[in-house]
């Protein structure tokens, strides 16, 4: 029962985690304009992995996609790759883990096969979670580096006359979503791996049948089974089914002149 619970919980936690990784990857707020100790503007900038957006105090929001591949920073490309790999591995892991769930009966699938599938999905979830955490951390590191660089050069003189204020960016909501989601996927993966150990069928223990002949004690061992020297009852190899199968199942918003958003 504990194995089923661990496996089921691992699946649910991973499912939530992967949904979070997908959400984080799609979110526009990976980096947001730093408003602290900065000249306050009537325009708020934020950026995602796929597009950058500007929200005016008028309510008008304009998002522009990054329509270039070669012109983008290598780090951004790396983060994109890590997140996509995380999503793909997580999705495959979810697919595998559905068939591995102990509460779902598929044909005459052996426990050993379910155990292997549980382990495989667990490892996939762990790698998926690590990819997401790594991707988000690389982006966060990039932000921190750029933040301090722009702070150092915050006011750059233009001909000694005019000051231009550089926009500084800080952590956006997507980073926190990504970290939490990656962590959940990782935890789910670990739980699947733990469940796998409980699923793996141990070699059956049968009591040795002793025939006492004159003076000699000979133990006859039924073929194909390992003899046990102990006489304790073996309950570890019982198959438990808890009922039938269960299924788990460049944008712009315009405020009209007459209808303010």
């Amino acid at each position: 029962m504990a194995v089923t619970a661990c496996q089921g919980l691992g699946f649910v936690v991973s499912l939530i985690g992967i949904a979070g990784i997908i959400a984080a990857t799609c979110m526009d707020q990976w980096s947001t304009q730093d408003l602290y100790n900065n000249p306050v503007t009537a325009v708020f900038n934020y950026q995602g992995l796929w597009r950058s957006c500007v929200r005016e105090s008028s309510g008008f929001t304009e998002c522009r996609g990054y329509f270039t591949l070669l012109g983008l920073p290598a780090m951004l490309q790396a983060v994109r790759a890590l997140m996509i790999v995380g999503i793909v591995l997580g999705a495959i892991g979810l697919l595998v883990s559905i068939f591995a769930l102990k509460c779902i009966r598929i044909g005459s699938m052996e426990d050993s096969a379910k155990a292997n599938m549980t382990l495989t999905s667990g490892i996939m979830f762990i790698v998926s979670g690590l990819c997401a955490i790594a991707g988000v951390s690389v982006f966060a590191n990039m932000l921190v580096t750029n933040f301090w660089m722009s702070t150092a050069n915050m006011y750059t003189g233009m001909g000694g006359m005019v000051q231009t204020v550089q926009t500084r960016y800080t952590f956006g909501a997507a980073l926190f979503v990504g970290w939490v989601a990656g962590g959940l996927t990782l935890i789910g993966g670990v739980m699947m791996c733990i469940a796998c150990r409980g699923l793996a069928p141990e070699e059956t223990n049968y009591k040795a049948v002793s025939y006492h002949a004159s003076g000699h004690s000979v133990a006859y061992k039924p073929g194909g089974f390992k003899a046990s020297t102990g006489f304790g009852s073996n309950t570890k190899n019982k198959k438990i089914y808890d009922g039938g199968a269960r299924t788990e199942d460049e944008v712009q918003s315009y405020p009209s002149k007459h209808d303010y958003v």
Epitope: A42, E56, Y260
Partner: antibody
Framework: QVQLVQSGAEVVKPGASVKVSCKAS???????VHWVIQAPGQGLEWMGE????????NYNEKFKKRVTMTLDRSTSTVYMELSSLRSEDTAVYFC???????????WGQGTLVTVSS | DIVMTQSPDSLAVSLGERVTLNCKSS????????????LTWYQQKPGQPPKLLIY???TRESGVPDRFSGSGSGTDFTLTISSVQAEDVAVYHC?????????FGGGTKLEIK
């Protein structure tokens, strides 16, 4: 038709306060409404803004201690109250609705406030 | 605060003449996020509230005659009236719509000779 209709002219004594209203009609009352002051023969000066959605306001530091912007959602009306009036506060006060580029597309007709003893 | 400096303070031109009004800001009004300049031009006639002409430094408001055009980026901006008409007599204001407090220029008074 979009309209911002302001209250009528006022004559007030120095040290007193004045409350100017701005009633919006013809559009959904959900975005920032700004207040702008124009002294006789002078340029325009931004006083502050209020968001009818959440009643949050931002004020120009110059007026911060004396100005209060409030609203009445039931009548789609924004109010601007200026206290401790001085003779130099004699001006036309405009309310304006925000538009693309944070520009002011719709303006009230203006309210002349005369501070005189 | 951002200082908006308009020049000239006033000018008198003949009907049909091309006129250029200037506006300079003490800081760049260009937003890197969308590459738009947050500068607005208004026309104000005596006894009336200002009227929106141009926003984002060069986008003409609907209903504004196409003889009005805005240009410039960063800190230097221009409002051009390609052929001045009698009804263009007014004070023209530029406004910083990027930094708080939102500031206006002193205005340029346009008259007909």
């Amino acid at each position: 038709q979009v309209q911002l209709v302001q209250s009528g002219a006022e004559v007030v004594k120095p040290g007193a306060s004045v409350k100017v209203s701005c009633k919006a009609s013809g559009y959904t009352f959900t975005n920032w409404v700004h207040w702008v002051i124009q002294a006789p023969g002078q340029g325009l000066e931004w006083m502050g803004e209020i968001n009818p959605t959440n009643a949050r306001s931002n004020y120009n530091e110059k007026f911060k201690k004396r100005v209060t912007m409030t609203l009445d959602r039931s009548t789609s009306t924004v109010y601007m109250e200026l206290s401790s009036l001085r003779s130099e506060d004699t001006a036309v006060y405009f309310c304006a609705g925000i538009y693309y580029g944070n520009s002011f597309a719709h303006w009230g007709q203006g309210t002349l406030v005369t501070v005189s003893s | 605060d951002i200082v908006m400096t308009q020049s000239p303070d006033s000018l008198a031109v003949s009907l049909g003449e091309r006129v250029t009004l200037n506006c300079k800001s003490s800081q760049s009004l260009l937003n890197a996020g969308n590459q738009k300049n947050y500068l607005t031009w208004y026309q104000q006639k005596p006894g009336q509230p200002p009227k929106l002409l141009i926003y984002w430094s060069s986008t003409r408001e609907s209903g504004v005659p196409d003889r009005f055009s805005g240009s410039g980026s960063g800190t230097d901006f221009t409002l051009t009236i390609s052929s001045v008409q009698a009804e263009d007599v007014a004070v023209y204001h530029c406004q910083n719509n990027y930094y708080y407090p939102l500031t206006f220029g002193g205005g340029t008074k346009l008259e007909i000779k």
